[in-house]
């Protein structure tokens, strides 16, 4: 007789979940030898210990500290690059400018990122069919938590210029419900954090408007500034010459305007 | 409140080696990040080394990897920077600290909450 499972409205835990992140956590550790004393078997035990037998409607930010632990790392707190609704270029900039990090550019980000997982309550099974979705299901779950967690300490971590990553072609280019807007812009340190410079980047080749004047963006300097934060933001016009113009900042054509 | 008291330091030849230790008390738990910092006259409180209590975490700073090694024995509370192949730019006044762990470590001396008196490494050539 099989046995009766809940039934959740999101996505099932991502196929292949344990040997992903065993092999993440292999790949990782060699590309940053930094991180060579992590031992990834039990970086994976703790994964699994964070959900595995729990319901996963309620998860707790303790539930992840063992990996955390695990997961301590060195950031270079004035070199933290935030992002919201635009990761793949976020991820595109720091693999040229090495030296800035988004989440992702860590172990535990990079073991999660673009990941689903969960498990089910009281027994060792990972739930493959389906997970909570954070709307229709419950906040908190695995993903959900993991995700609050780390974006909170990553924040906390933030000092001098922080910068962040939005996405112009939204109709929310700063969003109060993202992560960014909902976690991190309330966890930066205003004793350590001088300014927050947003660089807002355009979708249309022919859009020369001033997105820093958005409401949303206007609304995030609000937030910011009743943090005794400053506040900055840069249009960046075209985004590939941008990118183009980090790889080889000395080419002529990126004195003008990006 | 965590006390640390270094020990150790002295003056050494170029090439030579040193052994600080950093004696923690106050503490109820291992959560926490210890670190050694060095001084030189006029310049900047920098990080040489840093270490989870708790964990496998260790970092080095750059001018310090492959001479330098950070260890811990926790049953005496203890923390240890073994220095090796010292250089005259070694010389500095060093300094143990200690803050709550939390997962993303900054290298700066602003982060961490407490620190012993300093004990002095002299290193001529």
């Known amino acids: 007789v099989p046995r009766w499972r809940q039934q959740w409205s999101g996505p099932g835990t991502t196929k292949r979940f344990p040997e992903t992140v065993l092999a993440r956590c292999v790949k990782y550790t060699e590309i940053h030898p930094e991180m060579r004393h992590v031992d990834c078997q039990s970086v994976w035990d703790a994964f699994k210990g964070a959900f595995i037998s729990k319901h996963p409607c309620n998860i707790t930010e303790e539930d992840y500290q063992p990996l955390m632990k695990l997961g301590t790392q060195t950031v270079p707190c004035n070199k933290i690059l935030l992002w919201s609704r635009i990761k793949d270029l976020a991820h595109q900039f720091t693999q040229v400018q090495r030296d800035m990090f988004t989440l992702e550019d860590t172990l535990l980000g990079y073991l999660a990122d673009d990941l689903t997982w969960c498990g089910e309550f009281n027994t060792s099974k990972i739930n493959y069919q389906s997970c909570p979705d954070w709307r229709k299901d419950c906040s908190n779950n695995p993903v959900s938590v993991f995700w609050k967690t780390v974006s909170r300490r990553f924040a906390e971590a933030a000092c001098d210029v922080v910068h962040v990553m939005l996405n112009g072609s939204r109709s929310k280019i700063f969003d109060k419900n993202s992560t960014f807007g909902s976690v991190e812009v309330h966890n930066l340190q205003p004793e350590k954090v001088q300014t927050l410079e947003a660089w807002v980047i355009h979708g249309g080749r022919e859009d020369s408007r001033d997105l820093c004047q958005d409401p949303t963006i206007k609304e995030l300097e609000s937030i910011i500034s009743k943090r005794n934060i400053q506040f900055s933001c840069k249009n960046i016009y075209r985004p590939d010459k941008f990118l183009q113009c980090v790889k080889n900042p000395e080419d002529s054509s990126c004195t003008s305007e990006i | 409140q965590v006390q640390l008291v270094e020990s150790g330091g002295g003056s050494v030849q170029a090439g030579g080696s040193l052994r600080l230790s950093c004696a923690a008390s106050?503490?109820?738990?291992?959560?926490?990040?210890m670190a050694w910092f060095r001084q030189a006259p006029g310049k900047e409180r920098e990080v040489v080394a840093t270490i989870y209590i708790g964990g496998t975490y260790i970092h080095y700073a750059d001018s310090v990897k492959g001479r330098f090694t950070i260890s811990r024995d926790n049953a005496e509370n203890t923390v240890y920077l073994q220095m090796n192949n010292l250089k005259p730019e070694d010389t500095a006044m060093y300094y143990c600290a200690a803050t709550k762990w939390r997962p993303f470590i900054s290298t700066r001396a602003a982060e961490y909450n407490y620190w012993g008196q300093g004990t002095l490494v002299t290193v001529s050539s």
């Open positions: 106050g503490y109820t738990d291992s959560d926490y990040i």
